[in-house]
């Protein structure tokens, strides 16, 4: 009864440093409360980028100061990460947890490699 999480293998951020991808999970139970976390893995270090808990049927809400936004539809979450720079290029893992009702289930995606290219500065015009 493991929970499978699917996400794209590669995403290219826009020139404005915005990357979007879909995180889809196959729920083994009838969850009413779901937590979605974006993790960044660099070398063997894993850090939390952002997290949001939502009630099924309701909207996904990240904290005001979060670099993430998202929308949810059934077992699918559309995630957007903004403010990315070239140094943020890396593997971004979607983690889904079925929080309520029990039992708890954990689902971890294989990660999305996000490539960020800093835009070239505009040359001064005469």
């Amino acid at each position: 009864k493991a929970m499978h999480v699917a996400q794209p293998a590669v995403v290219l951020a826009s020139s404005r440093g915005i990357a979007s991808f879909v995180c889809e999970y196959a729920s083994p139970g009838k969850a009413t409360e779901v937590r979605v976390t974006v993790l960044r893995q660099a070398d063997s270090q894993v850090t939390e980028v952002c997290a949001a808990t939502y009630m099924m049927g309701n909207e996904l809400t990240f904290l005001d100061d979060s670099i993430c936004t998202g929308t949810s539809s059934g077992n699918q979450v559309n995630l957007t990460i903004q403010g990315l720079r070239a140094m943020d290029t890396g593997l971004y893992i979607c983690k889904v947890e079925l929080m309520y009702p029990p039992p708890y289930y954990l689902g971890i995606g294989n990660g999305t490699q996000i490539y960020v290219i800093d835009p070239e500065p505009c040359p001064d015009s005469d």
């Epitope: 009864k1 493991a2 929970m3 499978h4 083994p28 409360e33 937590r35 976390t37 993790l39 894993v46 850090t47 939390e48 997290a51 808990t53 893992i93 983690k95 947890e97 929080m99 309520y100 029990p102 039992p103 708890y104 289930y105 954990l106 971890i108």
Partner: antibody, heavy 118, light 108 residues
Framework: QVQLVESGGGVVQPGRSLRLSCAAS????????IHWVRQAPGKGLEWVAV????????NYADSVKGRFTISRDNSKNKLYLQMNSLRAEDTAVYYC???????????WGQGTLVTVSS | EIVLTQSPGTLSLSPGERATLSCRAS???????LAWYQQKPGQAPRLLIY???SRATGIPDRFSGSGSGTDFTLTISRLEPEDFAVYYC?????????FGPGTKVDIK
């Protein structure tokens, strides 16, 4: 560095109560699920309970459900286990454990011994 | 509840030998959610392997994990004196989070 320090263990009579505490440091406490795992003398490991993130969600082993209550205070980086109606079979070393962001149990406290005996 | 069974219960080997420890689950466990721990007398358990095959920080490469579905293996390629201990497998994909009964690796 990550540290988990348990306290509150001791000898207690069957049917009585005891409250364990765990002081955490070296990490962002509210971003992690924190567990209690116990080990009876000479026996294996048994997961007891977990409290998630803001403390609103908790899960328990069937063996302690209705008798034990796990809680956390994120402002103090502390985890608690309120143990009521204690039985002889609850005698064990109780470990406070951090669930890593990917789910596995990466840091363990040194443990605190609870002995239930008349 | 996922029940984990470990075999053998005790493994008697000499330093330098290879140790193969088995963990079997009562139902399929994603390899992402299977861990191995080492415990020595009087000490807390220590994480060795997570995700069935990833070594935890600071764990020597003589320790390796493998497996999928219901069958998982921990291998110690060449036993060092400090490796004689009890080893537990655990699943952390769903509650209740369960441990195997342990395999004791002792000196022959």
């Amino acid at each position: 560095q990550v540290q988990l320090v348990e306290s509150g263990g001791g000898v207690v009579q069957p049917g009585r109560s005891l409250r364990l505490s765990c002081a955490a440091s070296g990490f962002t406490f509210s971003s992690y699920g924190i567990h209690w795992v116990r080990q009876a003398p000479g026996k294996g490991l048994e997961w007891v309970a977990v409290t998630w993130y803001d403390g609103s969600n908790k899960n328990y082993a069937d063996s302690v459900k209705g008798r034990f209550t796990i809680s956390r205070d994120n402002s103090k980086n502390k985890l608690y286990l309120q143990m009521n109606s204690l039985r002889a079979e609850d005698t064990a070393v109780y470990y406070c454990v951090r669930g890593e962001l990917l789910g596995y149990f990466d840091y363990w406290g040194q443990g605190t011994l609870v002995t239930v005996s008349s | 509840e996922i029940v984990l069974t470990q075999s053998p219960g005790t493994l008697s080997l000499s330093p330098g030998e290879r140790a193969t420890l088995s963990c079997r689950a009562s139902q399929s466990v994603s390899s992402s959610y299977l861990a191995w721990y080492q415990q020595k007398p009087g000490q807390a358990p220590r994480l060795l392997i997570y995700g069935a095959s990833s070594r935890a920080t600071g764990i020597p490469d003589r320790f390796s994990g493998s497996g999928s579905g219901t069958d998982f293996t921990l291998t110690i390629s060449r036993l060092e004196p400090e490796d004689f201990a009890v080893y537990y497998c655990q699943q952390y994909g769903s509650s209740p989070f369960t441990f195997g009964p342990g395999t004791k690796v002792d000196i022959k």
